[in-house]
């Protein structure tokens, strides 16, 4: 069971300092952006991280949403990362959800975060280059210290 607590506005970056944004098709990608670019591209660069209390504490349970014309929430259904047109719900009556991730700081690096899927244990949000694109994907953690699953989260409130 997950119950919604407070939300905060954040900019999410990978460890190469590329900024997460959603494209016109509501797909999450990373690109090099100056602070000015980041502001100019808002609200596509501003993510709503909603925190949830968890009946089985396993880290800070969160959803990641974005509000452009409508609110869309990050999902890892079938291990495919996409934004689905939905508000983060007040309550989720399950111990797993495609939209709930456990946000934890990387041991020894308090400013670096990782996001583990509640649906797929051991799978994390990651940034991977595919052709010309730096994509947000779901990746099984295969090595300790994998930088692709580490992010910085800068609060904008």
């Amino acid at each position: 069971y997950f119950g919604k607590l407070e939300s905060k506005l954040s900019v999410i970056r990978n460890l190469n300092d590329q900024v997460l944004f959603i494209d016109q098709g509501n797909r999450p990608l990373f690109e090099d952006m100056t602070d000015s670019d980041c502001r100019d591209n808002a609200p596509r660069t501003i993510f709503i991280i909603s925190m949830y209390k968890d009946s089985q504490p396993r880290g800070m349970a969160v959803t990641i949403s974005v509000k452009c014309e409508k609110i869309s929430t990050l999902s890892c259904e079938n291990k495919i990362i996409s934004f689905k047109e939905m508000n983060p719900p007040d309550n989720i009556k399950d111990t797993k959800s495609d939209i709930i991730f456990f946000q934890r700081s990387v041991p020894g690096h308090d400013n670096k975060m990782q996001f583990e899927s509640s649906s797929y244990e051991g799978y994390f949000l990651a940034c991977e280059k595919e052709r010309d694109l730096f994509k947000l994907i779901l990746k099984k953690e295969d090595e300790l210290g994998d930088r692709s699953i580490m992010f910085t989260v800068q609060n904008e409130d």
């Epitope: 494209d23 016109q24 098709g25 797909r27 990608l29 079938n78 291990k79 495919i80 990362i81 996409s82 991977e128 595919e130 052709r131 010309d132 694109l133 994509k135 994907i137 779901l138 990746k139």
Partner: antibody, heavy 120, light 108 residues
Framework: QLQLQESGPGLVKPSETLSLTCTVS??????????WGWIRQPPGKGLEWIGS???????YYNPSLKSRVTISVDTSKNQFSLKLSSVTAADTAVYYC????????????WGQGTLVTVSS | ENVLTQSPGTLSLSPGERATLSCRAS???????LAWYQQKPGQAPRLLIH???SRATGIPDRFGGSGSGTDFTLTISRLEPEDFAVYFC?????????FGPGTKVDVN
Amino acid sequence: QLQLQESGPGLVKPSETLSLTCTVSGGSISRSYDYWGWIRQPPGKGLEWIGSIYYRGSTYYNPSLKSRVTISVDTSKNQFSLKLSSVTAADTAVYYCAREYSTTWSIDYWGQGTLVTVSS
Amino acid sequence: ENVLTQSPGTLSLSPGERATLSCRASQSIRNNYLAWYQQKPGQAPRLLIHGASSRATGIPDRFGGSGSGTDFTLTISRLEPEDFAVYFCQQYGNSIITFGPGTKVDVN
């Protein structure tokens, strides 16, 4: 709704260059983080990916065809093109232009296809 | 190059029966970048399943995809008359796309 339409000659002589153009309507090539590709299918056979292009111009080709293939894009016309040089009868096929959906690298929109015959 | 093998080559079934089509890769497919297409004579292929198990827009729920790594399956739970066609699998890896040779589903 995105639509793709191939155009170009249906008959090409051996050793010449096959040239096809794909016109995209219902969406802008340059506002998309997807790729635009060509696939062919010889009569009665399977599908073969030829290659694809990003709106910024970077290209990816089938290694077996790479030496003969050029794919280019013209964002002002919302078109992309295929050139295949030194053709032989083995290049006779239905040629499809298509969009590669970069979330899962699947091909979600296809043109209707155009038959190109290589014959003297 | 990651080579895809499809089996069987031809599947002869009757309407209402369950169809199970296999696609095997010579190397593991990263991030489940495997898709399934249906092609009818004289038509372009149509995307059915992407990401190994996600149905494309407008595809009926009798079509289902499963699998990971090197072994993938397309299941048609109850064949409708319009489902008799050729089915291709396709993978993406190292910036390259490859297709399987196809499975023909015909009427028994």
